[in-house]
Structure formats: structure tokens, C-alpha cells
């Protein structure tokens, strides 16, 4: 029997501050770049090595990012988002959905003594 | 894991035109960036050209107006027409790919923008 997969969903503020090459990440998403389907959302693709978002720590490829300074990042155009990102100043806060995978068990299958249900 | 093959290399004469293909993997294709480097022998990499998901196009003065990127999202595929070669275009021709938009200034000509790396064709110019 199959396990199915199921997806943790948390939010959390970040507070980056733009080192000498930037925030050091890249993007994809936006209404004209749908990277998820049916969500134009803004989605992290890379973190470069060394950049400010690295040497931080938190932020993860895969996040979702849902605002900027308090900006909401829904709806835009990927080149609107892009330049929100580089015209956000030297502190940003972003506002970030992490999604983790979390593979559960068989379905239906409980071990004896298991603590849950 | 983003593999990027190039091919279209070879031998031409001065004056001459190639194009260079390179095929890429992966679902999201039309959201990277693409370059392309070349190296010629006891040189350090070079920057050729650059397009943007938007097609959005970048080049070395040393070949502007006689090369051509060009992207086909449909094939996965990016492009380098080279036209009025000479014998100095002569190098191995290389790939780079990364995926999505920097949110930082974009600077086409570092090779640390672009984080996949194609393993190269090469074009000699006689």
C-alpha cells in the first residue's frame, strides 16, 4: 500500500538586509509565468552562495513569498516583482511560506502501541 | 537537475556561419536564464551572449551585430547564430543556465549568475 504524501504549510517573517551584491536569490512566478499551476505566485529558485539570503539562513528555493516590506505580492506581473525586489531598500522584511513534505505512512496501517489517533 | 547538451560546433572558414543549439531538461524551461561562455585555449572563460526568460537579449561587444541568441521555449532549446566569423571567435562554446530572475542587478557576464553548466562544442574558424 501506498503512503501518501502530505505538505506542512508554516509563514515567517524574514528581515534580510541587502549586502554589497544584494539579496542574493532568484525568482520565478508572476501572472505572465505561472511556475505553479493556477497559483501566479512568487516562488524563491535559487540562493546564491554567500549572498545575504544564504549567510541568514532561512530562506529556502521552494518558499513561497507573499510580500515585501508589507507589499503583497499577489498578482503581479514576474518583471513588476522583480523590480519590487530591487527597489525594496537596504532592509527588507519579507513575508515567506515554507512548505515541507511530509511522507506519512500506509493508510490504514496503525502499529500496536502507536501513540496517535 | 537542469542538463544542458550543446552541438552545431565544427570547422569553418573565416567569413563563414554556424549556429549552436543547446537542449536543455526540466518542466519549467521557459522561466531560465541562458548563456552562452566560450574558452579559447590558455584563456580565462568569456562571455558571449544572454537571454532572459522574456527573451530579452545581452551581448560582448566583441560580437555584437554578428551573433544571435534566440530561445525556443516550445523545444527547450536556446540558440547562438554566429555569422561574419573570425579566426578569434575560435573556442569551445559552452551553455549556462539558471533558473528564474535575479532580484538583484543582473550581470549576464559572471559566470557565478548562472549555476548549470553544458559541457561544450567546439568552433574553430580557419
Known amino acids: 500500500m501506498n503512503g501518501r504524501v502530505d505538505y506542512l504549510v508554516t509563514e515567517e517573517e524574514i528581515n534580510l538586509t541587502r549586502g554589497p551584491s544584494g539579496l542574493g536569490f532568484n525568482i520565478v512566478g508572476g501572472t505572465d509565468q505561472q511556475y505553479v499551476s493556477n497559483d501566479s505566485g512568487i516562488y524563491v529558485s535559487r540562493i546564491k552562495e554567500n549572498g545575504a539570503a544564504a549567510l541568514d539562513g532561512r530562506l529556502q528555493e521552494g518558499d513561497k513569498i507573499l510580500s515585501v516590506n508589507g507589499q503583497d505580492l499577489k498578482n503581479l506581473l514576474h518583471q513588476d516583482a522583480v523590480d519590487l525586489f530591487r527597489n525594496a531598500g537596504y532592509a527588507v522584511s519579507l513575508r515567506v511560506q515554507h512548505r515541507l513534505q511530509v511522507q506519512n505512512g500506509p493508510i490504514g496501517h496503525r502499529g500496536e502501541g502507536d501513540p496517535s489517533g | 537537475q537542469v542538463q544542458l547538451v550543446e552541438s552545431g560546433g565544427g570547422l569553418v572558414q573565416a567569413g563563414g556561419s554556424l549556429r549552436l543549439s543547446c537542449a536543455a531538461s526540466?518542466?519549467?524551461?521557459?522561466?531560465?536564464?541562458l548563456g552562452w561562455f566560450r574558452q579559447a585555449p590558455g584563456k580565462e572563460r568569456e562571455f558571449v551572449a544572454a537571454?532572459?526568460?522574456?527573451?530579452?537579449?545581452y551581448y560582448a561587444d566583441s560580437v555584437k551585430g554578428r551573433f544571435t541568441i534566440s530561445r525556443d521555449n516550445a523545444k527547450n532549446t536556446v540558440y547562438l547564430q554566429m555569422n561574419s566569423l573570425k579566426p578569434e571567435d575560435t573556442a569551445v562554446y559552452y551553455c549556462a543556465a539558471v533558473i528564474g530572475s535575479t532580484v538583484d542587478t543582473y550581470n549576464p557576464g559572471d559566470p557565478l549568475e548562472y549555476d548549470y553548466w553544458g559541457q561544450g562544442t567546439q568552433v574553430t574558424v580557419s
Open positions: 537571454i532572459t526568460w522574456s527573451s530579452g537579449t
Open positions: 526540466g518542466r519549467t524551461f521557459s522561466t531560465y536564464t
